[in-house]
Interface confidence: low
């Protein structure tokens, strides 16, 4: 018995179905086929879980969180024992193992391993200003999304005809910050933060209004 090499890693957007491949060759009839799928979740590597089991001609549910969402892609028994997971959740991310036994064929590699990463687009980011908006001050524009896998990067742009940040601005796309030093009237305007990752983007807007000093009355 020999389980074929798997693609190694699969990525899927949250809520979408995933297919985890596992096929094998065997010299024996599929009378005593026994297949177990296990997962070592990324979120809890110390607690491997059973996903689905095929034994004695019957299918058995694994961990409760997979109930109703998991099944074999084809009619069993078969040499293709790939499974699908519907409505993928973030907690489904992990390392999946298919373990195949088909007595009396007991030689060879009986395990296939596939990594599953459930991707999440960035949630609507939160934009805010830190610091005084008085002319000549330094301000920091902050942007962050609660969710996003892989971790989003953040791009700030000023919504004017140039889409460029003021020359005194420095941007950190990982942290989602823009520091604008020595703000002036020209710094005023609408700023947009674009949070993006491999499967989506999301934006927020921020209105920066630089406050000029009030003229003092004489006399």
């Amino acid at each position: 018995l020999e389980v074929s090499e798997s693609p190694g890693s699969i990525q899927v957007a949250r809520g979408q179905p995933a297919v985890l491949p596992c096929t094998f060759t065997t010299s024996a009839a599929l009378i005593n086929l026994n297949v177990i799928w296990m997962v070592t979740p990324l979120s809890n590597a110390n607690q491997p879980e059973q996903v689905i089991l095929y034994q004695g001609g019957q299918m058995f549910d694994g961990a409760p969180r997979f109930h109703g969402r998991v099944g074999f892609t084809g009619t069993m028994p078969a040499t293709n024992v790939s499974i699908f997971i519907n409505n993928t959740q973030l907690s489904d991310t992990g390392t999946y193992q298919c373990l195949v036994n088909n007595l009396p064929d007991i030689g060879g590699r009986n395990i296939g391993v596939t990594g599953l990463t459930v991707l999440v687009p960035p949630s609507a980011p939160h934009c805010q200003i830190q610091g005084s908006q008085d002319i000549g001050s330094d301000v920091i524009l902050l942007c962050s999304s609660e969710e996003g896998i892989p971790r989003p990067t953040y791009l700030w742009e000023k919504l004017d005809n140039t889409l460029k940040l003021p020359p005194t601005a420095t941007q950190d796309q990982v942290q989602g910050t823009v520091t604008i030093r020595n703000i002036s009237a020209l710094s005023s305007g609408l700023y947009q933060c674009v949070a993006s990752n491999a499967i989506g983007t999301s934006t927020c807007l921020l209105d920066l209004q630089v406050i000029s000093p009030q003229p003092r009355n004489i006399g």
């Epitope: 177990i36 590597a45 607690q47 034994q55 193992q97 036994n101 007991i106 590699r109 009986n110």
Partner: antibody, heavy 121, light 108 residues
């Protein structure tokens, strides 16, 4: 036939180190997870550690975490247990066991004869 | 960690009698993740039951497992002379894997 033979046990002083080996034969070693289980004299069984077939996943009992390291060399069909900072309470017969083919979390049918580790000053 | 408590500590019975061994978990164990082992003096343990009720290969059908949640039972329907030994339950649903303290089945 399946054989598991442990070696490396003996008498060692507290705080010292010891490395146990388990030589496997009669099956495709690289396809099976392997466990270490110990049994103190006259006491019950205590699971120590497990390693997945390719060595990518390892789990330990709290009592040995940070002191013991399970590893394997599939090219040599050998399982290892590196035991550091040994304590008197680590005195036990140490068994290696092959996981069940259908569930690698189950210790399975096949166990070695055990090797005795005595930690004493 | 999940603590398993076995009872009774010792069971004195005669060959041909029925043996009922109990294993209680401190927290719920998925029935897919409980095993029973037999150990005779000077020997390594032997897997009898896994998944709470699935007999391991080569295990006689006089051995049966049942239970779910926190209460599990190993039943030996008719004791044979070779069944007198120590029996351990073990959970493998959460790390660390843990064993019960054992039940000794001895000849009355």
């Amino acid at each position: 036939q399946v054989q598991l033979v442990e070696s490396g046990g003996g008498v060692v002083q507290p705080g010292r180190s010891l490395r146990l080996s388990c030589a496997a034969s009669g099956f495709t070693f690289s396809s099976y997870a392997m466990h270490w289980v110990r049994q103190a004299p006259g006491k019950g069984l205590e699971w120590v550690a497990v390693i997945s077939y390719d060595g990518s996943n390892k789990y330990y009992a709290d009592s040995v975490k940070g002191r013991f390291t399970i590893s394997r060399d599939n090219s040599k069909n050998t399982l290892y247990l590196q035991m550091n900072s040994l304590r008197a309470e680590d005195t036990a017969v140490y068994y290696c066991a092959r996981a069940s083919p259908s569930q690698w979390l189950v210790l399975g049918h096949y166990w070695g004869q055990g090797t005795l580790v005595t930690v004493s000053s | 960690e999940t603590t398993l408590t076995q009872s009774p500590g010792t069971l004195s019975l005669s060959p041909g009698e029925r043996a009922t061994l109990s294993c209680r978990a401190s927290q719920s164990v998925s029935s897919s993740y409980l095993a029973w082992y037999q150990q005779k003096p000077g020997q390594a343990p032997r897997l009898l039951i896994y998944g709470a009720s699935s007999r391991a290969t080569g295990i006689p059908d006089r051995f049966s497992g049942s239970g779910s949640g926190t209460d599990f039972t190993l039943t030996i329907s008719r004791l044979e002379p070779e069944d007198f030994a120590v029996y351990y339950c073990q959970q493998y649903g959460s790390s660390p894997w843990t064993f019960g303290q054992g039940t000794k089945v001895e000849i009355k």
